[in-house]
Interface confidence: low
Amino acid sequence: HHHHHHEQKLISEEDLGGEQKLISEEDLRAPRCRELPAQKWWHTGALYRIGDLQAFQGHGAGNLAAPISGLKGRLDYLSSLKVKGLVLGPIHKNQKDDVAQTDLLQIDPNFGSKEDFDSLLQSAKKKSIRVILDLTPNYRGENSWFSTQVDTVATKVKDALEFWLQAGVDGFQVRDIENLKDASSFLAEWQNITKGFSEDRLLIAGTNSSDLQQILSLLESNKDLLLTSSYLSDSGSTGEHTKSLVTQYLNATGNRWCSWSLSQARLLTSFLPAQLLRLYQLMLFTLPGTPVFSYGDEIGLDAAALPGQPMEAPVMLWDESSFPDIPGAVSANMTVKGQSEDPGSLLSLFRRLSDQRSKERSLLHGDFHAFSAGPGLFSYIRHWDQNERFLVVLNFGDVGLSAGLQASDLPASASLPAKADLLLSTQPGREEGSPLELERLKLEPHEGLLLRFPYAA
């Protein structure tokens, strides 16, 4: 059953006695294949947020202001990242803090025209990249939801959902919903419109909150809502705390499909030191749910390294000319171009992880079991039926240490073998493909390992 699924019938002796059937001994021995879950496109890989289209374009060709058409030229790059959806914008007209001058149906001409957008949708469709539109109304203003005119704004959102669904978008995002009065009921209504149009459409809500109770109350009345929050950014970047956050979340949400990110909009570098970026990439791609990244996360884009750049939307570094403001500020290894040519780069790691995430059954929809390991470590298994299984071991700490994997925590269906093959390490120097003895496994500081092993009956 490796990488495929077919229906198998359980056959009783009675069946055999009656009608003559050609059934081999192997057929009788083979356990029944587990039925595949229904998977939507956002279950199959990562989402990629482009909150500021002008910053994404880079400064190379001047301060670019029709970036929707420029984005079309970057779709091949997004395909190379194997991301499944693009979360775009907001791109609608919004005069800051002015409800009357906020039109969710009109594209701000600084971003391009409707013809640019239609063309982008068509091109993205051809490349199997879905487009999710951010409709956060007052994105240029103080309060994203114009706190005093909630009903007016909610009506505008409703109209916009219907309009953009007709226009062919694949989903929507609304952020800062902690500022939206009666958020749960509005989200339920917007979810109904979105899903009423097609079950294949997605609604993402974002909140700055990291409080599990607040998050649960938003999820409670909204099944299938994908929620991004600051929940994981509270981990203090320690293994034990991250493990407890992840397992608490999965338990509290009843293992419903979720998304994983460190915030609703910001870059990983806003929360993490450079040495933990690889570890977090590995974790986000291998937890059960949809990983959500911001443009630049794949190269470790860091606003702090670019003088004068806004923290929330630094310029994307395509090559060394992307930030001409200060000559020499950008070295090749900070850019897409430079990292594309380096198999050991963060970008290369991102591409490999994204590829695995989008094709391996155990990572696509496999069960998740966390288990005990050495101090500062977070380790878990992903497995699905008789497909290849994955073991993830993450060392958040500053010191190298033995993995100390406590396999006794695991259920019988997810037991550990004596050896597993190294698929990849976040650090250089290990021989990929080599079998590692799990009892003797040691990890370098900040190292994450992705190991694979076969199903054994």
Epitope: N63, L64, L105, Q106, P109
Partner: antibody
Framework: QVQLVQSGAEVKKPGASVKVSCKAS????????MHWLRQAPGQGLEWMGW????????NYIQKFQGRVTMTRDTSISTAYMELSRLRSDDTAVFYC??????????????????WGQGTLVTVSS | EIVLTQSPGTLSLSPGERATLSCRAS???????LAWYQQKPGQAPRLLIY???SRATGIPDRFSGSGSGTDFTLTISRLEPEDFAVYYC?????????FGQGTKVEIK
């Protein structure tokens, strides 16, 4: 307000080239495609193609391919249209134009709303 | 490409009269993307109607547009002296964008 100001009239000999400029003001130059059109004396309007000032991408109609080059200089918010190997039947007024995005009853629209004043190019031996 | 044919070529009318101009397309045009322009001698065209029937900003309400598919009409309900000019229809729904050959509205 939006203004498109074109360069002055030109007289050219057959086989020569002409380069017409169109300086934009009153809006973000790189935010809109610039379209070029021509109108022979006493004739109708003919669309030649566009340039995306943002990226420099161009789209020319087949009739002009190989003879027309549209460029831009974002630092001075100016678009250019160069027509080479001129013939006498290229005598025309050339216009640059920009769309305006309208929205009504659920439909976006982008007709050519803003036009330059036109540049007369006379090709004569 | 879509060919637009305008009729009549010339329309001779007096001020105060109603003018009806026709534009026929060689294949169906999305009514969302049909425009009408007015051009006076020595001037650039001026947008009157877009989306077949919506008046552009600042255009008086004596100008109206209608039609769908392949047949479109521009109507000037009461001609004013300043309305005597050449009128062009244009489709911008599919590339290449094309114009009709124009209808001249002249004073009788």
């Amino acid at each position: 307000q939006v203004q498109l100001v074109q360069s002055g009239a030109e007289v050219k000999k057959p086989g020569a080239s002409v380069k017409v400029s169109c300086k934009a003001s009153g809006y973000t130059f790189t935010g809109y495609y610039m379209h070029w059109l021509r109108q022979a004396p006493g004739q109708g309007l003919e669309w030649m193609g566009w340039i995306n000032p943002n990226t420099g991408d161009t789209n020319y109609i087949q009739k002009f391919q190989g003879r027309v080059t549209m460029t831009r200089d974002t630092s001075i918010s100016t678009a250019y249209m160069e027509l080479s190997r001129l013939r006498s039947d290229d005598t025309a007024v050339f216009y640059c134009a920009r769309i305006r995005v309208y929205y009504e009853s659920g439909i976006y629209n982008y007709p050519l709303h803003h036009w330059g004043q036109g540049t007369l190019v006379t090709v004569s031996s | 490409e879509i060919v637009l044919t305008q009729s009549p070529g010339t329309l001779s009318l007096s001020p105060g009269e109603r003018a009806t101009l026709s534009c026929r397309a060689s294949q169906s045009v999305s009514s969302s993307y049909l425009a009408w322009y007015q051009q006076k001698p020595g001037q650039a065209p001026r947008l009157l109607i877009y989306g077949a029937s919506s008046r552009a900003t600042g255009i008086p309400d004596r100008f109206s547009g209608s039609g769908s598919g392949t047949d479109f009409t521009l109507t000037i309900s009461r001609l004013e002296p300043e309305d005597f000019a050449v009128y062009y229809c244009q489709q911008y729904g599919s590339s290449p964008w094309t114009f009709g050959q124009g209808t001249k509205v002249e004073i009788k």
